[in-house]
């Protein structure tokens, strides 16, 4: 695959993968009601990270947010925290590789500044999925954790006046934000490190005839450091070196452009 | 001005089926749920079921499935209960109720009056 | 199925008198979501429809007046009529709107004395 597919399939990868960590952030539906063993209630209860909602039988829904800091558990404070960096990483990262673009002509910059901005934002973007893969499994943890003990209250009869009284337990299992937070999650650390390995491809050339002058002229030059460098006259700074980066580009140019990414 | 419709009295032989009818008007009929529910003369309130305009989607009290069969015509927005296998336990007049928020029946209709004899 | 009791069955009273009616439940009827109970009270008068006139067991449906009072949590509830006139004659009914099947009360009757 070529560089200029490899970044920008990383970018569309990536970009995917962060609106659903926003979506993901914003939906509801973090855990659901669990009906199953349930009596059917007319009611059915989800919570989100920020809201909890109610949907009654009549189609009645009521949400109500959380309006205080302190009452709430420290579990779902560091979830928020973990999907809020998540996002703000994602922006980031999104902003840099933009200009990190191949395909996106800025001003005079040359390739060296590319690959340093498109590894940036490939290691944000990891960071960002990373963030949100760890954010959505505390929370699975939480519930399930919660749901045994909701269970185990069932079934050893302590929701009740001396047995004469039964109470319905509400128990909550997975909502749909969980598996929107892991897929997306994973999308844009699959996309951080697809831009992580277009990386590579930018890192200016200057690396390889370092390598190449050293074995051509292995017997004859003796080596000594930043010999190379003088040696060549391909140092960072020459202009030589952006003529023949032009070729590279010439040869990228010619591998079929990612043009339309369709997704579901 | 809310209303819920429903027809007139019948008179059935026991084994034989009836379908009755209820047509709401003075609101959208897909936004709320039809509630059915039976009244033995002199007696207290028993719930059939109901059934959601907008997914023709029925629920049953377990007591009433298979012989109660509720559906619903968007276009004339009526809701129907169809009640088979009629015995003279059956006669009592049915009423039809729109649920609202707190899942209160908040309209109900005037009732029908069923009447099974041979 | 949730049962529900309501006590007394009749209840013989005057006008302006204050009057209490109980409904309990055999299961909570307290929703842990959005801490309301799912019960409501319907008032039938003879050869009437029931008509609705406490939802979420405390919320007055609109119209009906500030006489009728639904109170009560989880299991044990309460309509009371602070002053009974003799309109408000007719049985009362408790309705479980919580679990399926809905379920009603016998019904408390309310008589002149």
């Known amino acids: 695959m070529s560089v200029t597919a490899c970044q920008g399939l990383g970018f569309v990868v990536s970009l995917i993968g962060f609106a659903g960590i926003i979506a993901a952030t914003c939906m509801d539906q973090w855990s659901t009601q669990d009906l199953y063993n349930n009596p059917v209630t007319a009611v059915f209860n989800y919570q989100g990270l920020w809201r909890s909602c109610v949907r009654e039988s009549s189609g009645f829904t009521e949400c109500r947010g959380y309006f205080t800091l302190l009452g709430l558990p420290a579990m779902l404070q560091a979830v928020r925290a973990l999907m809020i960096v998540g996002i703000v990483l994602g922006v980031i990262g999104i902003l840099v590789s933009i200009f990190a673009l191949k395909c996106i002509r800025i001003g005079s910059m040359d390739d060296s500044a590319k690959a340093k901005m498109t590894l940036t934002s490939g290691i944000l973007f990891i960071i960002s999925g990373i963030c949100a893969i760890i954010g959505v499994s505390v929370f699975a943890n939480m519930l399930v954790t919660n749901f045994w003990m909701s269970t185990a209250n069932m079934y050893s009869g302590m929701g009740g006046m001396g047995g004469m009284v039964q109470t319905v337990q509400t128990r909550y299992t997975f909502g749909a934000a969980l598996f929107v937070g892991w897929v997306a999650g994973g999308l844009t650390l699959i996309g951080g490190v697809m831009m992580c390995i277009a990386c590579r491809g930018l890192t200016p050339d200057d690396s390889n005839f370092k390598a190449v002058s050293y074995h051509a002229s292995g017997q004859n030059v003796a080596y000594r450091p930043g010999g190379f460098k003088a040696s060549t006259g391909f140092g960072s700074n020459t202009r030589n070196k952006k003529i023949y980066d032009g070729g590279a580009r010439t040869e990228d140019d010619e591998q079929s452009h990612p043009t339309k990414y369709d997704y579901v | 001005e809310v209303q819920l419709q429903q027809s007139g009295p019948e008179l059935v032989k026991p084994g034989a089926s009836v379908k009755m009818s209820c047509k709401a008007s003075g609101y959208t009929f897909t936004n709320y749920i039809i509630h059915w529910v039976k009244q033995k003369p002199g007696q207290g309130l028993e719930w059939i079921g109901y059934i959601n305009p907008y997914t023709d989607g029925p629920k049953y009290n377990e007591k009433f499935k298979g012989r109660a069969t509720l559906t619903s015509d968007k276009s004339s927005s009526t809701a129907y209960m169809e009640f088979s296998s009629l015995t003279s336990e059956d006669s009592a007049v049915y009423y039809c109720?729109?649920?609202?928020?707190?899942?209160?029946?908040?309209?109900w209709g005037q009732g029908t009056s069923v009447t099974v004899s041979s | 199925d949730i049962v529900m009791t309501q006590s007394p069955s009749s209840l013989t009273v005057t006008v302006r008198e204050k009057v209490t009616l109980s409904c309990k439940s055999s299961?909570?009827?307290?929703?842990?979501?959005?801490?309301?109970?799912?019960l409501t009270w319907y008032q039938q008068k003879p050869g009437q429809p029931p008509k609705l006139l406490i939802y979420w067991a405390s919320t007055r449906e609109s119209g009906v007046p500030d006489r009728f009072t639904g109170s009560g949590s989880g299991t044990d509830f309460t309509l009371t009529i602070s002053s009974v006139q003799a309109e408000d004659l007719a049985v009362y009914y408790c309705q479980n709107v919580y679990i399926y099947p809905f379920t009603f009360g016998a019904g408390t009757k309310l008589e002149l004395k």
């Open positions: 109720a729109r649920l609202n928020r707190g899942n209160a029946m908040d309209y």
């Open positions: 299961q909570s009827l307290l929703n842990s979501g959005n801490q309301k109970n799912y």
